[in-house]
């Protein structure tokens, strides 16, 4: 027995039924992507990172989900201390607030 057609990657098993006239076939099939690949064509890649290149996990669709304290398309921008002046403060680590020269205070304001 052979089956021809598109089967999208899924964790669920699909039941296929086939009647050849001589015999009746019923079988279960599933297609899964390789580790860290996602999407209908398994053509999206996401592997969790926590380094210079980004700080993220991956959701069930292969989208990057930033770790707490990080943001941006690659989750490599730190979220500064709440209230940190966007004009006179900045940070490279989450929750930090580093002041520009000439500015001071908890929020560099």
């Amino acid at each position: 027995a052979s089956h021809s057609g598109m089967i999208n990657p899924s964790r669920q098993w699909q039941t296929l039924k086939q009647n050849t006239g001589v015999a009746h076939f019923e079988y279960q099939i599933r297609v899964t992507c390789d580790d860290y690949y996602y999407g209908f064509g398994c053509n999206k890649f996401c592997r969790p990172r926590d380094d210079f290149f980004g700080h993220y996990a991956c959701d069930q669709n292969g989208n990057k989900t930033c770790m707490e304290g990080w943001m941006g398309p690659e989750c490599n921008r730190a979220i500064c201390r709440q209230g940190c002046s966007p004009k006179h403060g900045s940070c490279k680590l989450p929750g930090d607030c580093r002041c520009q020269y000439g500015w001071q205070g908890l929020y560099c304001d």
Epitope: D34, Y36, Y37, F45, R47, D51, F52, F53, G54, G72, P73, E74, N76, R77, K92
Partner: antibody
């Protein structure tokens, strides 16, 4: 569309420094890191380093440590690569490239010739 | 640093041939591998990223496979425009080293 446009060819003497620029357009400059890659005549590709355009942090290949400086000017969406103490072996085409999962976009290349 | 061993360094083939280029890494890089094509006087062109994902606009005769330390670039049926030099590169950790290249020539 995304473009990376590099500065023109340079002829330098041994011991001098060279600064190559890479002006980008077509996307938010600080969203993507910029890498620098070089290729000596008839040779393969050599990765030199990466700069995080948002923070200005850079990481260099060991071979270039102490001789290379990568910087950015976010106001003009331009990345720079400066190589000092030039020697004849530094004669190469220098490329800037954008990306995280490989380099989909490259500059046109800048030929740097080091000769006395 | 992660070492990249690309083979063969040169290869002669004919239009219509199936060609395979391999890249081996000195340590596990998962699927952080990219393949490029370069023609003389031009910047490299991205073909495949994350070991097996075809970049947009790249013909389907190109395919990539492998993970861990062993990777393959396959061209199923060579076309005249495919004669060029091919490079692999890892993007797992710094430095992002390249393989030595494979020059694909017309037989």
């Amino acid at each position: 569309q995304v473009q990376l446009v590099q500065s023109g060819a340079e002829l330098k003497k041994p011991g001098a420094s060279v600064k190559v620029s890479c002006k980008v357009s077509g996307y938010a400059f600080t969203d993507y890191a910029i890498h620098w890659v070089r290729q000596a005549p008839g040779q393969g590709l050599e990765w030199m380093g990466i700069i995080n355009t948002y923070y200005g942090d850079s990481k260099y290949a060991q071979k270039f440590q102490g001789r290379v400086t990568m910087t950015v000017d976010t106001s003009t969406s331009t990345a720079y690569m400066e190589l000092s103490s030039l020697r004849s072996e530094d004669t190469a085409v220098y490329y800037c490239a954008r990306g995280y999962d490989g380099f989909a976009y490259w500059g046109q290349g800048t030929l740097v010739t080091v000769s006395s | 640093d992660i070492q990249m061993t690309q083979s063969p360094s040169s290869l002669s083939a004919s239009v219509g041939d199936r060609v395979t280029i391999t890249c081996r890494t000195s340590e596990n890089i998962y699927s952080y591998l990219t393949w490029y094509q370069q023609k003389p006087g031009k910047a490299p062109k991205l073909l495949i990223y994350n070991a097996k994902i075809l970049d947009s606009g790249v013909p389907s005769r190109f395919s990539g496979s492998g993970s861990g330390t062993d990777f393959t670039l396959t061209i199923s049926s060579l076309q005249p425009e495919d004669f060029a030099t091919y490079y692999c590169q890892h993007h797992y950790d710094i430095p992002w080293t390249f393989g030595g290249g494979t020059k694909l020539e017309i037989k």
